[in-house]
């Protein structure tokens, strides 16, 4: 008799999830010498242990602690780039500016980027059919809790000047409900972080508005300032030129505003 299976509103676990995580771990540890000591089988076991046999709406940060411990990594705390709703450009940037890091440039972020996963209560099976949706089902699901946990730790580690890339094409350039707005902002440590610098990325070619004056940016400025962290903001009017100038800073066209 087939066992009844909970139907969730979100997509199921990514195909070949265990193999993908293991392969990514191996690849990452090969590329990053400082992480060569990591045993990828142990990493997978810890990852699996965080959600297998557990109700996918009852996952806690505690469940991920063994994985966090194994994935402990030191990145230069003054070279952190946060982002919100503009992941691709943030990643393109750190691929060029190799001394800066997004969360997905760390081992744990790299392992889980763009993946979905969940298990089922009291069985060792991975659910490939459906997983809980954050809004429609529950917020304490395996994926959301993972990103909340690693995002908090990443923000807590930051120091000096922290940069954040924000999408100027969205109605809410700064969204209090995003991971950046709900987790990272509140876990920057005022004792270590002097300034949060926002880069607002413009979408339209002819968009010359000062998006740093947007009401949501003013809201971010106030939230950050009240954490005793200074705030600054820059418009990136031409993201394509911005990336080009990161690649070739000596280019004569790179002295003008981008």
């Amino acid at each position: 008799v087939p066992r009844w299976r909970q139907q969730w509103s979100g997509p199921g676990t990514t195909k070949r999830f265990p193999e993908t995580v293991l392969a990514r771990c191996v690849k990452y540890t090969e590329i990053h010498p400082e992480m060569r000591h990591v045993d990828c089988q142990s990493v997978w076991d810890a990852f699996k242990g965080a959600f297998i046999s557990k109700h996918p709406c009852n996952i806690t940060e505690e469940d991920y602690q063994p994985l966090m411990k194994l994935g402990t990594q030191t990145v230069p705390c003054n070279k952190i780039l946060l982002w919100s709703r503009i992941k691709d450009l943030a990643h393109q940037f750190t691929q060029v500016q190799r001394d800066m890091f997004t969360l997905e440039d760390t081992l744990l972020g790299y392992l889980a980027d763009d993946l979905t996963w969940c298990g089922e209560f009291n069985t060792s099976k991975i659910n490939y059919q459906s997983c809980p949706d954050w809004r429609k089902d529950c917020s304490n699901n395996p994926v959301s809790v993972f990103w909340k946990t690693v995002s908090r730790r990443f923000a807590e580690a930051a120091c000096d000047v922290v940069h954040v890339m924000l999408n100027g094409s969205r109605s809410k350039i700064f969204d209090k409900n995003s991971t950046f707005g709900s987790v990272e902002v509140h876990n920057l440590q005022p004792e270590k972080v002097q300034t949060l610098e926002a880069w607002v990325i413009h979408g339209g070619r002819e968009d010359s508005r000062d998006l740093c004056q947007d009401p949501t940016i003013k809201e971010l400025e106030s939230i950050i300032s009240k954490r005793n962290i200074q705030f600054s903001c820059k418009n990136i009017y031409r993201p394509d030129k911005f990336l080009q100038c990161v690649k070739n800073p000596e280019d004569s066209s790179c002295t003008s505003e981008i």
Epitope: S225, K226, N228, Q230, F231, S232
Partner: antibody, heavy 114, light 111 residues
Amino acid sequence: VEESGGRLVTPGTPLTLTCTASGFSLSRYYVTWVRQAPGKGLEWIGIIYISGTTYYATWAKGRFTISKSATTVDLRIASPTTEDTATYFCAAAWPVGTYVLPLWGPGTLVTVSS
Amino acid sequence: AAVLTQTPSPVSAAVGGTVTIKCQSSQSVVNANNLSWYQQKPGQPPKLLIYLASTLASGVPSRFSGSGSGTQFTLTISSVQSDDAATYYCLGVYDDDGDNAFGGGTEVVVK
């Protein structure tokens, strides 16, 4: 930092106080205005951020305006009353910080009297 | 608007003794810790002592300490010296800047 512009004014006469700094540029720091009536406690008036964004205490809204130039931060008292008689301090969040006030001027006295 | 109540005032202490000043807020300060303490002597501007509830400002003697979170905060002066005679103020910062305020002040008299 140092405040200037304090003087005797008649009620209703607008007055602008100026905060200047030596050794660093105020435009790169958060600056707060505070006042103290004779023999009384401190009152938080408002703050201006590096960006120029301003916030005011509820009681001060509409009565005071904080603005900045490249080198100074001003406090304008739109229509002073006798209750505005006080020593006015500007305080800078220097070298780091925002609402924390490590650097204060000596104050400038404003007397409102007819 | 937020109200910050400081108690007691005045407070008197002997040299070498300990003084505790309380600051109670009618609502929680930002991040539960955005409260600072200032010392003011007659004819002088205030001087920052403690910020973010418990962080000692640069150059301030370690006999000054701050504690508390949310709505209840304390400034403690241990091994009181005659130079500590002054009025002490707390400053609370709130989600709505309109509520930002100093406490009424506590005068410390050293005998």
